[in-house]
């Protein structure tokens, strides 16, 4: 067959579903490879086409499309599971062409199993929440195209196993699910089931989310540096070691970049000739604020070293602080025989 | 606002030595770095050296090592620089020059204020 | 030391062209590159540091691009005020080496 543009397999699109549920799959080539949407490409005489290779196969083969129950079918630009079973699990191709022109994408599709308590090997979407922030919505999530509008579907709302009924602070409604007040003990995965009917069949699609509770912005402040501070001095003789932490805490902010660096003389210590090295450990907590740890380390300080000036800076999305080291020589203890003696007025 | 303000103009005899201050004033003076930048008539920009007022720390141009010095006075904000055995060819406006502290963000050291510079005539 | 070339040397634009200078650095600098303006005895002026950012209140017309040993400064639409010489300088380690400048003249 003629040469065709091939994007190879789109790992980046590791799709995962559940066993016996509805999928859609859309074909990946107009979102994300090519500048044209389906419509374009069909007005111009371009054909859509389907293959895949079974897991632990190496063999394309046609999708079969003449199935009980139309179980695969193919609708514009999607791949329709009416449901899936465990052995759909492979790597799917769309391949768009006509006579001059082909452009493929492989995409993997694996069909997971849950258990009776929606736990799988599912990889789960994160939902941030802020903590004690008034009333906050999660939404029941990829569920668009599935039914139309006119066709009214139930959902359930479950936290881990249970189904929200009366709890104190987290409410159904319909596609939505609202905390009232949302608390550390809301952390935990929350899934929706969507039973809908299609053509005299009911069908299913549950979705679980991971909801965790952070740090809310009304708490939210400037990077506060801990250390290095006004009480500690590192006082120090040439040759010795010098340690020097700059531990600072960052406030949660959504999508913020901390930073924390360390100048010496004003400059980054890797633009001046000391032997100079920067161990840095995170730790977070409950609420996603961070503690950044950066230690400074110089392995055998000289005289020069103990007058520089060291200084840790930190950036959020809040503001920049900096904080400098005192740093200084150690003042060598007097040896009595001569100093002291002197002092007595000894000659 | 920030501002660099040197001393005046200078005529020197060949072999002498010439000091140029810059007082500077509007920004925290000891966490920055002061440039020297000197350009002969009809010249290019020749970076001389620096200092950071905090600890006193100089980097100097090759070219210049053996002459030049440049030191600070923290109490008043000044920075100094002394260039020695004068010759005809060190005929130059010389400039003192602010660079920032290294930012995680902003980068390196680029001059961002500079002094209306301080012309220096050696001639004997 | 790092060495910078400027080019060209010189060149003669008229108002409301594109104008583009170069400049080359005899190893990588990363991004440590600034560009300055310089009108007939005044002090140079920071236009851009950072190899692209743009310094306080300079006028959006001025850009900057590049990495490691290749640098742009580009005018999209010379004004009047535009014409003077330009100098590229690396701004990274403990020493700091310029261009030689290039002259913008009005054509």
């Known amino acids: 067959s003629e040469r065709c543009d091939d994007w190879g397999l789109d790992t980046m699109r590791q799709i995962q579903v559940f066993e016996d549920e509805p999928a859609r799959i859309k074909c990946p080539l107009f979102e994300h490879f090519l500048k044209f949407n389906y419509s374009t490409a069909h007005s111009a005489g371009l054909t859509l086409i389907w293959y895949w290779t079974r897991q632990d196969r190496d063999l394309e083969e046609p999708i079969n499309f003449r199935l009980p129950e139309n179980r695969i079918s193919k609708e514009k630009d999607v791949l329709w599971f009416r449901p899936t079973l465990l052995n759909d699990t492979g790597n799917y191709t769309c391949m768009l062409r006509n006579t001059t022109y082909c452009s493929k994408v492989a995409f993997p599709l694996e069909v997971v199993q849950k258990d009776s308590c929606f736990n799988s090997p599912m990889k789960l979407p994160v939902h941030k929440l802020y903590i004690e922030y008034g009333i906050q919505r999660i939404t029941c999530p990829n569920v668009d195209g599935y039914f139309p509008s006119s066709v009214k579907p139930t959902i359930t709302w479950y936290m881990g196993c249970y189904k929200i009924q009366n709890f104190n602070n987290v409410i159904p409604e319909g596609m939505n699910l609202s905390f009232l007040i949302a608390l550390i003990s809301n952390n935990g995965n929350y899934t929706c089931v969507v039973t809908y009917p299609e053509n005299g069949r009911t069908f299913h699609l549950t979705r679980t989310l991971t909801v965790k509770v952070v740090g809310s912005p009304k708490n939210a402040v400037p990077p506060v540096i801990h250390s290095p501070n006004d009480h500690v001095v590192y006082e120090k003789e040439p040759g010795e070691e010098l340690l020097i932490p700059c531990t600072v805490y960052f406030s949660f902010l959504m999508d913020s970049r901390n930073e924390v660096w360390w100048t010496i003389d004003g400059k980054k210590p890797d633009d001046i000739t000391i032997d100079v090295t920067i161990n840095e450990s995170i730790s977070h907590s409950r609420t996603e604020d961070e503690t950044r740890t950066q230690i400074l380390s110089i392995k055998k300080v000289t005289s020069e070293d103990l007058k520089r000036s060291y200084v840790c800076h930190a950036r959020s999305a809040k503001g920049e602080v900096a904080k400098a080291a005192k740093v200084k020589q150690k003042v060598p203890a007097p040896r009595y025989t001569v100093e002291l003696a002197c002092g007595f007025g000894a000659t | 606002q920030v501002q660099l303000v040197q001393s005046g103009a200078e005529v020197k005899k060949p072999g002498s030595s010439v000091k140029v201050s810059c007082k500077a004033s509007g920004y925290i003076f000891l966490t920055y770095w002061m440039n020297w930048v000197r350009q002969a008539p009809g010249q290019g920009l020749e970076w001389m050296g620096q200092i950071f007022p905090a600890s006193g720390s100089a980097y100097y141009n090759e070219k210049f090592k053996d002459r030049v010095t440049i030191t600070v006075d923290k109490s008043t904000s000044t920075a100094y620089m002394e260039l020695s055995s004068l010759r005809s060819e060190d005929t130059a406006v010389y400039y003192c020059?602010?660079?920032?502290?290294?930012?995680?963000?902003?980068?390196?050291?680029?001059?961002?204020?500079w002094g209306q510079g301080t012309l220096v005539t050696v001639s004997s | 030391d790092i060495q910078m070339t400027q080019s060209p040397s010189s060149l003669s634009a008229s108002v409301g062209d594109r104008v583009t200078i170069t400049c080359r650095a005899s190893?990588?600098?990363?991004?440590?590159l600034a560009w300055y303006q310089q009108k007939p005895g005044k002090a140079p002026k920071l236009l851009i540091h950072y190899a692209k950012s743009l310094a306080e209140g300079v006028p959006s017309r001025f850009s900057g691009s590049g990495s490691g040993t290749d640098f742009t400064l580009t005018i999209s639409s010379l004004q009047p005020e535009d014409f003077a010489t330009y100098y590229c300088?690396?701004?990274?380690?403990?020493?700091?080496?310029f261009g030689q400048g290039t002259k913008l003249e009005i054509k």
């Open positions: 300088q690396h701004h990274y380690g403990t020493s700091l080496t």
């Open positions: 020059a602010r660079s920032g502290p290294y930012s995680y963000y902003a980068g390196g050291y680029a001059l961002d204020y």
């Open positions: 190893q990588s600098i990363s991004s440590y």
